[in-house]
Amino acid sequence: GSVKVLHEPSCFSDYISTSVCQWKMDHPTNCSAELRLSYQLDFMGSENHTCVPENREDSVCVCSMPIDDAVEADVYQLDLWAGQQLLWSGSFQPSKHVKPRTPGNLTVHPNISHTWLLMWTNPYPTENHLHSELTYMVNVSNDNDPEDFKVYNVTYMGPTLRLAASTLKSGASYSARVRAWAQTYNSTWSDWSPSTTWLNYYEPWEQHL
């Protein structure tokens, strides 16, 4: 039977080394055996490159394309092939479809004055455009109480958040995770970082009386 694309490719770039495209076929497909995504930078002399897709689900294909350090002017021509059959053709401008890398190494440390210091790493090297553009969202949730969660927006430069222990339930176990976005690039949110868990052992003030 003929091969058809149900949902055409949607692509995002981490704006440093990789762009990822995902699409859905109209029936279960062995993506790596049946399909190829070709990509070529719209720049004089550029070569055509081929990405071998992998299956994410039965009919969902994903292709990770290594790209050079992206700049705003870069535009790629994309062609999705099933053998000699062109299934889809389009263009992709990484600077207009940014999904930042996931923040790393989230840790929680006790700090002075009954506060917790949450720290993580900026996923971009200092020379990359996005290094100074990221803002973060931190989600803190009670492991035993789904209703007890807080969301903090970190809009200042440093990848840190100070959290008063008194804002959390004493003796409860909490988990935190962090994600990033780049406002000036109108990016989507990054994936969430892995969670880190700690015990909030703050004693309420009344217990001292």
Epitope: F43, G45, N48, V71
Partner: antibody, heavy 125, light 112 residues
Framework: EVQLVESGGDLVKPGGSLRLSCVAS????????MTWVRQAPGKGLQWVSL????????YYADAVKGRFTISRDNAKNTLYLQMNSLRAEDTAVYYC??????????????????WGQGTLVTVSS | DIVMTQTPLSLSVSPGETASISCRSS???????????LDWYLQKPGQSPQGLIY???KRASGVPDRFSGSGSGTDFTLRISRVEANDTGVYYC?????????FGQGTKLEIK
């Protein structure tokens, strides 16, 4: 040492054909785009054509489009320019030059960093 | 097509002085920050052209630091300080950003 040696230039009548060759050595030929530039007697430089490293993409000046064909044989480290339907205004010294490195996703550019000695094409009846 | 306009078309300079050649393009040659696609070439009498400057300001291998390029967007300048007799020839600017690649008309530098 990088070397580019052009050959094939000759006296040819209008409407005739000629094939220029440029043999390269001293660098990884397939990694680089190659360019032809010409210079009419007493005139300035005029770009003619470019081919990327794999040979998969070619570009031409309007003045030669449809008449000239650029190609390459990476196994022989040789660049070609097939010139058909030649006209008097094609009379020039033809230079081949090493252009951008096209092995990377975005071609890396270092200028036309090496030129051949040129070969003279004369179109006259 | 991108039109390249050089000024002056000829220049006469005494040894030891500084020579400046201007090149203006009809469209911006800045692809991104730090990437200005403008080259300078020198063709000495009876020789093939040789590269001097690429990407607006980067010196080609073996080119003395007396040669410097500057500019961005549509306005570029080649400066030759402490001019020597050996610098005689025709200087061309060229844009390698878009097909067709285009050259300026050339500037003939004469040493007095």
């Amino acid at each position: 040492e990088v070397q580019l040696v052009e050959s094939g230039g000759d006296l040819v009548k209008p409407g005739g054909s000629l094939r220029l060759s440029c043999v390269a050595s001293g660098f990884t030929f397939r990694d680089y785009a190659m360019t032809w530039v010409r210079q009419a007697p007493g005139k300035g430089l005029q770009w003619v054509s470019l081919i990327n490293g794999s040979g998969g993409k070619t570009y031409y000046a309007d003045a030669v489009k449809g008449r000239f064909t650029i190609s390459r044989d990476n196994a022989k480290n040789t660049l070609y320019l097939q010139m058909n339907s030649l006209r008097a205004e094609d009379t020039a010294v033809y230079y081949c030059a090493v252009d951008r490195k096209t092995k990377t996703i975005r071609p890396q550019y270092y200028g036309l960093w090496h030129w051949g000695q040129g070969t003279l094409v004369t179109v006259s009846s | 097509d991108i039109v390249m306009t050089q000024t002056p078309l000829s220049l006469s300079v005494s040894p030891g002085e500084t020579a400046s050649i201007s090149c203006r393009s009809s469209q911006s040659l800045t692809y991104s920050i730090g990437y200005n696609y403008l080259d300078w070439y020198l063709q000495k009498p009876g020789q093939s052209p040789q590269g001097l400057i690429y990407l607006g300001s980067k010196r080609a291998s073996g080119v003395p630091d007396r040669f410097s390029g500057s500019g961005s967007g549509t306005d570029f300048t080649l400066r030759i300080s402490r001019v020597e007799a050996n610098d005689t020839g025709v200087y061309y600017c060229m844009q390698p950003l878009q097909s067709p690649l285009t050259f300026g008309q050339g500037t003939k530098l004469e040493i007095k």
